[in-house]
């Protein structure tokens, strides 16, 4: 109820407070390194307010500077597993439109089983963000271990 | 002086810019895995603007989507220490009210001595966040190595 | 175009939405552990809206609470390299004015090749942030692997 009231008081859409927090749905088929995400109140604590999902990838709806953050934990993992399967790397980037394709954030697991990071980056309406996990290890689907989100910060 | 002026110009409470950054006070007694936090200008660079501390745990005062972040560094640690005492795991979750109890963010140290992460999550007035460190290792009380905070992002 | 419109609608300067995201320019000369940063649209996805660079160090222009974040990846690195060259430590702090000098955030690499973290901290106009990398290993200059930024959160 208080959420609804607050949204009446503040025209959030005009303020541009776009925000999304996603949980892992599944990995891609062979040769597709992308992680596929899902979000929505029915799924627990994930949500999309502004951005949308397009075949499991996050599409931006408002120009601006965004804080992008991610955490990925490998599913069956110990430091020896991680080092044996090295390199396992996660990259977050703009994958479409092709003209704006760029890697925004990249991390390797080395001897760890979790990576987590965040950065500020300009994004434009229509940019689709992809998260590529290279290597043979599978990410955990636990919602407290693997998640991906964006937060609009300013125009 | 500029802080005071800014607060007169912007009714921060109505905007809902609740924010807190805490430093470690101490670990719990045996069988209590919770970390106990402290905050306030007298303690250095920690603060609470909106949220409150309840027996060392952070209680939320305003509904909304929050960015939750944490860094914990182990006090006496090398990669061999960390792996010898594995699993040492940190979990951040809502611990009360019991009806809303859930793990929000979880990380293991594996061969590292520091974990750091952040995520967006909906929180409601009255939610108390607990940070549980399982394992026998002591976290550093240095304010630049171990800290925990939340930032209100939108309703 | 939409960026320009948005800026007309919202007097961002009065709102105080200062924000910066920097990429690594170079390391310092011997005996200078500081990383030197650069930012601006000509360099890719780095930018400064409010804060300024002073000889490669970030200077704050507006009092407030900021979210400070950083990721540093070592250039030629494996878990064995990292552990052999231990301790390699990154510290972010206020380095001037001298009266406000303090370490804000500190991380060691141990057996990893990347550190990433973030924290909320009060900063004042004129504060200069320095990022000190101690040890013999060189940081990667790739813009998706090494970056440093701040975001004004509230007065």
């Amino acid at each position: 109820q208080r959420f609804a009231q607050a949204q009446q008081q503040l025209p959030l859409e005009s303020l541009g407070w776009d925000v999304a927090e996603l949980q892992l749905n599944h990995t891609g088929p062979q040769q597709d390194p992308r992680l596929y995400w899902q979000g929505g109140p029915a799924l627990g604590r994930s949500f999309l307010h502004g951005p949308e999902l397009d075949k499991g990838q996050l599409r931006i709806h408002r120009d601006g500077i965004y804080m992008v953050h991610i955490q990925v934990t490998l599913a069956i993992c110990s430091s020896t597993t991680a080092s044996r399967h090295h390199p396992t790397t996660l990259a977050v980037g703009i994958c479409s439109p092709a003209s704006r394709s760029i890697s925004l954030l990249r991390l390797s697991f080395h001897q760890g089983c979790t990576i987590a990071s965040q950065r500020l980056t300009p994004l434009a309406r229509g940019d689709t963000l992809c998260t590529n996990l290279t290597g043979t290890l599978l990410p955990s689907r636990n919602t407290d271990e693997t998640f991906f989100g964006v937060q609009w910060v300013r125009p | 002086q500029r802080f005071a002026q800014a607060q007169q110009q912007l009714p921060l409470e109505s905007l809902g810019w609740d924010v807190a950054e805490l430093q470690l006070n101490h670990t719990g007694p045996q069988q209590d895995p919770r970390l106990y936090w402290q905050g306030g200008p007298a303690l250095g660079r920690s603060f609470l603007h909106g949220p409150e501390l309840d027996k060392g745990q952070l209680r939320i005062h305003r509904d909304g989507i929050y960015m939750v972040h944490i860094q914990v560094t182990l006090a006496i640690c090398s990669s061999t220490t960390a792996s010898r005492h594995h699993p040492t795991t940190l979990a951040v979750g809502i611990c009360s009210p019991a009806s809303r109890s859930i793990s929000l963010l979880r990380l293991s140290f594996h061969q590292g001595c520091t974990i750091a992460s952040q995520r967006l999550t909906p929180l409601a007035r009255g939610d108390t966040l607990c940070t549980n460190l399982t394992g026998t290792l002591l976290p550093s009380r240095n304010t630049d190595e171990t800290f925990f905070g939340v930032q209100w992002v939108r309703p | 175009q939409r960026f320009a419109q948005a800026q007309q609608q919202l007097p961002l300067e009065s709102l105080g939405w200062d924000v910066a995201e920097l990429q690594l320019n170079h390391t310092g000369p011997q005996q200078d552990p500081r990383l030197y940063w650069q930012g601006g649209p000509a360099l890719g996805r780095s930018f400064l809206h409010g804060p300024e660079l002073d000889k490669g160090q970030l200077r704050i222009h507006r009092d407030g609470i900021y979210m400070v974040h950083i990721q540093v990846t070592l250039a030629i690195c494996s878990s064995t390299t990292a552990s052999r060259h231990h301790p390699t430590t990154l510290a972010v702090g206020i380095c001037s004015p001298a009266s406000r000098s303090i370490s804000l955030l500190r991380l060691s690499f141990h057996q990893g090749c990347t550190i990433a973290s973030q924290r909320l901290t009060p900063l004042a106009r004129g504060d200069t942030l320095c990022t000190n990398l101690t040890g013999t290993l060189l940081p990667s200059r790739n813009t998706d692997e090494t970056f440093f930024g701040v975001q004004w959160v509230r007065p």
Partner: antibody
């Protein structure tokens, strides 16, 4: 009342291993946040921090002496033992033990010390 | 490891003098610093903890200040019983490290 008492040989030969014991009373080493440190002082020289052990068995050693030191505590939690291998005449010093009552309370660091024990290294 | 550099290593002073001893840390140690006094043949005695907090029972002529990397121990008016050696100790990160000591001698 809190006391710490060091004991061990007065004289050791070069290349031998030194074993020192710190016996504590008036407090228990059962709290994970509590610990005992060994510190030494060669005659006429400065204090040198050697090693620390917490009740949960976490240990830290002086970097320069790490390869020669081992710190441990006995199961009764009343004794902390320091062993130092390959003794040399330069290791001649008074060896002290001191306590940290609570890692998270800086006012409790090294509030109590033992009287020290002088160890000479000579053939 | 954090290096602690204490200066001067020795000094001569007279009763009633104001004495200042400094300690510099190789990296920021916040306020995690203690000062100890040691007299010949005696156990070190803690004077100051947390950089500036006076140990109970220690006379108020002793004071500590500083934070980060620069620290000072001040004796406002030297008394005969203050002639001793003084050590700083960083308590920020394990392994802890002492400064090299400052011997305060009678002028």
């Amino acid at each position: 009342q809190v006391t710490l008492k060091e004991s061990g040989p007065v004289l050791v030969k070069p290349t031998e291993t030194l074993t020192l014991t710190c016996t504590v009373s008036g407090f228990s080493l059962s709290n994970a946040r509590m610990g005992v440190t060994w510190i030494r002082q060669p005659p006429g020289k400065a204090l040198e921090w050697l090693a620390h052990i917490f009740s949960n068995d976490e240990k830290s050693y002086s970097t320069s002496l790490k390869s020669r030191l081992t710190i441990s505590k006995d199961t009764s939690k009343t004794q902390v033992v320091l062993t130092m291998t390959n003794m040399d005449p330069v290791d001649t010093a008074t060896y002290y033990c001191a306590r940290i009552r609570d890692y998270y309370d800086i006012s409790s660091y090294y509030d109590y010390w033992g009287q020290g024990t002088l160890v000479s290294v000579s053939s | 490891d954090i290096q602690m550099t204490q200066s001067p290593s020795a000094m001569s002073a007279s009763v009633g003098d104001r004495v200042t001893i400094t300690c510099r840390a190789s990296q920021d140690i916040s306020n995690y610093l203690a000062w100890f006094q040691q007299k010949p043949g005696k156990v070190p005695k803690r004077l100051i903890y947390a950089a500036s907090s006076l140990q109970s029972g220690v006379p108020s002529r002793f004071s500590g200040s500083g934070s980060g990397t620069e620290f000072t121990l001040t004796i406002s008016s030297l008394l005969p019983e203050d002639f001793a050696t003084y050590y700083c100790l960083q308590l920020n990160s394990f392994p802890f490290t002492f400064g090299g000591g400052t011997k305060v001698e009678i002028n």
